[in-house]
Amino acid sequence: SEVEYIAEVGQNAYLPCSYTPAPPGNLVPVCWGKGACPVFDCSNVVLRTDNRDVNDRTSGRYWLKGDFHKGDVSLTIENVTLADSGVYCCRIQIPGIMNDEKHNVKLVVIKPAKVTPAPTLQRDLTSAFPRMLTTGEHGPAETQTPGSLPDVNLTVSNFFCELQIFTLTNELRDSGATIR
């Protein structure tokens, strides 16, 4: 199943995807689409690159802010809304028949909550639940495999709503995580 990345409404979401150009500088076309990667190309294309640059964007909110020329084709979606939630496909279109690399990533957009969890709860949340928090301008540089989590310092305010905080607190207590 896809790795999940979480962003708050109004924040920027970061969906990682990368490849290693071989040889360096030998870029290949990439498309990002809304929906799981289909057999061919991308469905509902939101952004497309050619061998040189981004040549198709369906909205000014979609950006490649990483080092595109080194194969970092991670997608940044600015000012996300609940409608941006869902699975996205990053397709690295390597020449040849059926050579494409396909990566499905899931974006979960949440409403800003009215409460701020304690710092330790923030950290424990990230260690107890293998989902990426992607509220900053940039996120982890590499695609994570399901179940893994980069050891990054996450500062997320207004994370979940009160009910979710309560539920997660109980789950963390059951899992042995520290709660203060």
Partner: antibody, heavy 116, light 107 residues
Amino acid sequence: EVQLVESGGDLVQPGGSLRLSCAASGFTFSTYWMTWVRQAPGRGLEWVANIKQDGSAKYYVDSVKGRFTLSRDDAKNSLYLQMNSLRAEDTAVYYCARGSNWFDYWGQGTLVTVSS
Amino acid sequence: ETVMTQSPATLSVSPGERATLSCRANQNVYSNLAWYQQKPGQAPRLLIYDASTRATGFPARFSGSGSGTEFTLTISSLQSEDFAVYYCQQYNNWPLTFGGGTKVEIK
């Protein structure tokens, strides 16, 4: 108005060849994947082959690989399917369709009958 | 290959009634599923794509739902022009495959 018009269907003997054509109009042909889908008489639909916008990649269902060749001529807004070593099981109406994964416009079809 | 199974093969419905058509995949196809309508002597017409997005030209009485392996096409109130054969098609796995079709006929 988008239009796709197939031609070239005929009665042919097993082992024979045919070339189907699809003339496209009403859209920018060169920016779309194009596809052939077939339907045997009284039967369901079967995807046959498709071709990328620039012609750099062509894909075929296993049952026609090595026998059918897909090509396009963007200057003529046309799609072609060269069918060799035809078999009785290739008998079908062949539809030209626009798209790669799902197909939003279809032609009226051309009937290919393979029989001795 | 991904096998798409449609049921029932034939559905007899009276005009004005609701019709529910099922399509099942033998492996996950996410929401990469389309529905087509085909009338006798005509080419298929795209009806639904991405499991639930209605194509241009079809009214709101047609709706698609489901993801993964189970999908449904619902026609809320059948009109005379809706009697046809309906095919589902997955585009998640190689090769692209269609279901065998469901014929919706007048009861």
